[in-house]
């Protein structure tokens, strides 16, 4: 029985003949014939094709627009697209990284669980009992309440998720 595809993976069928696809980095100029092989040409500057193909035009490299907060993370080649990332303090809005937004800050009462990267936003978490955050920050974690006992002090004012405990001297009974 015939295989499901008459030609091999890096070939295509045209005019009852299996022609070679063009290798990555090259575009199709003319199909093969009985007398000639497939004719391919390298992609131009700022163009690429990343697969074996029969494209007659190469794709343009992605432009990392600084007005959208983008910068080049990896320069494109004839076989790969340019990879964009965001400027410091910003992150991509999508996997394709077509624009950037400012990293979010964690409000008081919340701490940073995971610091933002060029491709992911800050992840905040509520400060659990025994911890607090009194600032809006993209870097600060929840801090533990001060331990009055270790300073030989007592709690004068209880801590919250936004404030530290207030310690004071112990009330000593007069003799």
């Amino acid at each position: 029985p015939e295989p499901p595809t008459a030609c091999r993976e890096k070939q295509y069928l045209i005019n009852s003949q299996c022609c070679s696809l063009c290798q990555p980095g090259q575009k199709l100029v003319s199909d093969c014939t009985e007398f000639t092989e497939t004719e391919c040409l390298p992609c131009g500057e700022s163009e690429f094709l990343d697969t074996w193909n029969r494209e007659t035009h190469c794709h343009q490299h992605k432009y990392c627009d600084p007005n959208l907060g983008l910068r080049v993370q990896q320069k494109g080649t004839s076989e790969t697209d340019t990879i964009c990332t965001c400027e410091e303090g910003w992150h991509c809005t999508s996997e394709a990284c077509e624009s950037c937004v400012l990293h979010r800050s964690c409000s008081p009462g919340f701490g940073v669980k995971q610091i933002a990267t060029g491709v992911s936003d800050t992840i905040c978490e509520p400060c659990p009992v025994g911890f607090f955050s009194n600032v809006s920050s993209a870097f600060e974690k929840c801090h533990p309440w001060t331990s009055c006992e270790t300073k030989d002090l007592v709690v004068q004012q209880a801590g919250t998720n936004k404030t530290d405990v207030v310690c004071g001297p112990q009330d000593r009974l007069r003799a």
């Epitope: 015939e2 295989p3 008459a6 030609c7 091999r8 890096k10 070939q11 069928l13 009852s16 003949q17 299996c18 022609c19 070679s20 696809l21 290798q23 093969c32 009985e34 007398f35 092989e37 497939t38």
Partner: antibody, heavy 118, light 107 residues
């Protein structure tokens, strides 16, 4: 499964003729250029001839030009090599192979021995 | 005709070792070079096509590379099944020409 099976080899005297056949199966024979390659007992491999899909384009190595004829019958999925005026230096195992870009020589037959000797 | 100069002609390698075979083309052949493996009394088997592309089913320890007119076949960690005869072929122009081959043995 792609299969190429050569036949027609054997012992032949110098100056005589012999015809090799290669029966192809497991692929659409007419879509692929084909070739013959040989391997002498004490020497390396040598390309002999290539034929295009419908036989309109044929190439030979210089030493066999005018003596050997490559042909194909797409209806029978068979490749042929007609060898005339055989010489002792034609003694070799002859392989039938697909000559298809970008892979070239991607599948080979098991080979058939041709011995030219008096 | 394009001459393909292959080296070494034979090599003895220990299991697990890395080794490289080279073919040098006498004129420009672009990436039109294939590598084949042949076992005794068997037909050749395509390993690498267009200088760097691994044929389906060939273990990833095999790789092909090009530096100018020098083409290399490398086996990263030799296994016992890798013994045999290796040769290159240029497919850039007729007559298609072969390297003289390299016999690979286990030390």
């Amino acid at each position: 499964e792609v299969q190429l099976v050569e036949s027609g080899g054997g012992l032949v005297q110098p100056g005589r003729s012999m015809k090799l056949s290669c029966a192809a199966s497991g692929f659409t024979f007419s879509y692929f250029p084909m070739a013959w390659v040989r391997q002498a007992p004490t020497k390396g491999l040598e390309w002999v001839a290539t034929i295009s899909t419908s036989g309109g384009n044929i190439y030979y190595r210089d030493s066999v030009k005018g003596r050997f004829t490559i042909s194909r019958d797409n209806a029978k999925s068979t490749l042929y090599l007609q060898m005339n005026s055989l010489r002792s230096e034609d003694t070799a195992t002859y392989y039938c192979t697909r000559d298809t870009a970008p892979y070239y020589f991607d599948y080979w037959g098991q080979g058939v021995m041709v011995t030219v000797s008096s | 005709d394009i001459q393909m100069t292959q080296s070494p002609s034979s090599i003895s390698v220990s299991l697990g070792d890395r080794f490289t075979i080279t073919c040098r083309a006498s004129q420009d052949i672009g990436n039109y070079l294939n590598w084949y493996q042949q076992k005794p009394e068997k037909s050749p088997k395509l390993m690498i096509y267009r200088a760097t592309n691994l044929e389906d089913g060939v273990p990833s320890r095999f790789s092909g590379s090009r530096s100018g007119s020098d083409y290399s076949l490398t086996i990263n960690s030799l296994e016992s099944e890798d013994t045999g005869f290796y040769f290159c072929v240029q497919h850039k122009q007729y007559p298609l020409t072969f390297g003289s081959g390299t016999k690979l043995e286990i030390k």
